[in-house]
Amino acid sequence: GWVWNQFFVPEEMNTTSHHIGQLRSDLDNGNNSFQYKLLGAGAGSTFIIDERTGDIYAIQKLDREERSLYILRAQVIDIATGRAVEPESEFVIKVSDINDNEPKFLDEPYEAIVPEMSPEGTLVIQVTASDADDPSSGNNARLLYSLLQGQPYFSVEPTTGVIRISSKMDRELQDEYWVIIQAKDMIGQPGALSGTTSVLIKLSDVNDNKPIFKESLYRLTVSESAPTGTSIGTIMAYDNDIGENAEMDYSIEEDDSQTFDIITNHETQEGIVILKKKVDFEHQNHYGIRAKVKNHHVPEQLMKYHTEASTTFIKIQVEDVDEP
């Protein structure tokens, strides 16, 4: 019968010929009366056999990631008679793995959106690298993730690639972050190969800023001939938030005379001071009113940022009109 051990050949061997093992018949007494032959894909080009001894050699550099095993056939013939000594047999040569592939992130570019002021531990995104080396061969394809850029705001779970928030972020200070993640094989041991990827993390706005008046004091004038409903001027607040989180409503906080009103122009986000009652210069020619501004939409959990509404004082001077 045939005698052999399992055949392995390391990939990426640089030698011109590498001894893999020996195929022989147990009838072979070593007197060179048998001839061994190799058949099948790779025979003669990738692998050769010593016809006399049955020693098999790899004569080409192999890449396990391209082909991890070869199925060949062996024959042994009695030189004297030309007959097969053993029935033709199939055998396998396995290409064994070396760590010659770095981890690669296949789904890049990565981009994630997370609300500003999210608490520590909030999941942002999971990045995954793959390694073409053999996962069953040692640690060649066992990966560890680490953060190269993004501290102290982000952290990455070493074995899963899950990125989490590690420190609260304020969109109004910085609205996006580039995080660089490294994946290292060999679980980070010497000889490890690595790959990196960038993750763009954008902060979405939450309503964590209240509107604040641009001026703490305004001066407006109104003619005593102005009819009720007249717009006598505008006031303006600013809000560092964006979109609907910056929409605001103006109102009167204090007007003993009940002469004025404020309406909100929701397109310009300005407050328009309106004459509610006609004024009479001879009766009163100086008014002072206090206006306040609040956001239109404030979720309950964000009320802590909106405890005291911003106010402004408006001095209104009545202009005299000569009466007939």
Partner: antibody, heavy 120, light 107 residues
Framework: QVQLQESGPGLVKPSETLSLTCTVS??????????WSWIRQPPGKGLEWIGY???????YYNPSLKSRVTISVDTSKNQFSLKLSSVTAADTAVYYC????????????WGQGTLVTVSS | EIVLTQSPGTLSLSPGERATLSCRAS???????LAWYQQKPGQAPRLLIY???SRATGIPDRFSGSGSGTDFTLTISRLEPEDFAVYYC????????FGQGTKVDIK
């Protein structure tokens, strides 16, 4: 802290024009929303408001003095001025410049005052 | 114009006593448009109260203002030696007018 300082002649002849200047420091006369006033106080008597000006040049005067008063502003010098024409002895007083408040038309900041005597 | 009448003309009190000064307007004014000032000899008036109960910066809480309509009051809860001075009320709704003053002197 806003400070105001009156300056001008301490003696004016009857029928002439009294001229005073108020120099503002520690703040801009062009600050939005503030009015700059002149107020006087005859010796041993009460206070009388003369008029005010806004940095844009818009002025408003006490109706009883309106025909004789002009208040002007020079934003480049951070100053405003009072001119009172055709003075008589009744115009003898300590003249104060003042700025109104951030929450109303009351007088929050005052100069220390300058005595102007009308006499020949 | 709105005439403000202060009473009494002179108030003679001792340190530690309570002072109540009155200011009456010739017609109704909003309480938001009244102020009180203190003046010592040779000095400019100093704002005490405005609107009519807000204390100006640096004014001790023994000073308080109240009132509405035509009757307004300045109260000094416990007179200190430095409180002896002349006090003026002022309205700033219809032009600007001052009361004639109340002198608080040491009894």
């Amino acid at each position: 802290q806003v400070q105001l300082q009156e300056s001008g002649p301490g003696l004016v002849k009857p029928s002439e024009t009294l001229s005073l200047t108020c120099t503002v420091s520690g703040g801009s006369i062009s600050s939005s929303g503030y009015y700059w006033s002149w107020i006087r106080q005859p010796p041993g008597k009460g206070l009388e408001w003369i008029g005010y000006i806004y940095y844009t040049g818009s002025a408003y005067y006490n109706p009883s003095l309106k025909s004789r008063v002009t208040i002007s502003v020079d934003t480049s010098k951070n100053q405003f001025s009072l001119k009172l024409s055709s003075v008589t002895a009744a115009d003898t007083a300590v003249y104060y410049c003042a700025r109104d408040g951030s929450s109303g038309w009351y007088f929050q900041y005052w100069g220390q005052g300058t005595l102007v005597t009308v006499s020949s | 114009e709105i005439v403000l009448t202060q009473s009494p003309g002179t108030l003679s009190l001792s340190p530690g006593e309570r002072a109540t000064l009155s200011c009456r307007a010739s017609r109704q004014i909003s309480s938001s448009y009244l102020a009180w000032y203190q003046q010592k000899p040779g000095q400019a008036p100093r704002l005490l109260i405005y609107g009519p109960s807000s204390r100006a910066t640096g004014i001790p809480d023994r000073f308080s203002g109240s009132g509405s309509g035509t009757d307004f009051t300045l109260t000094i809860s416990r007179l200190e030696p430095e409180d002896f001075a002349v006090y003026y009320c002022q309205q700033y709704g219809s032009s600007f007018t001052f009361g004639q003053g109340t002198k608080v002197d040491i009894k």
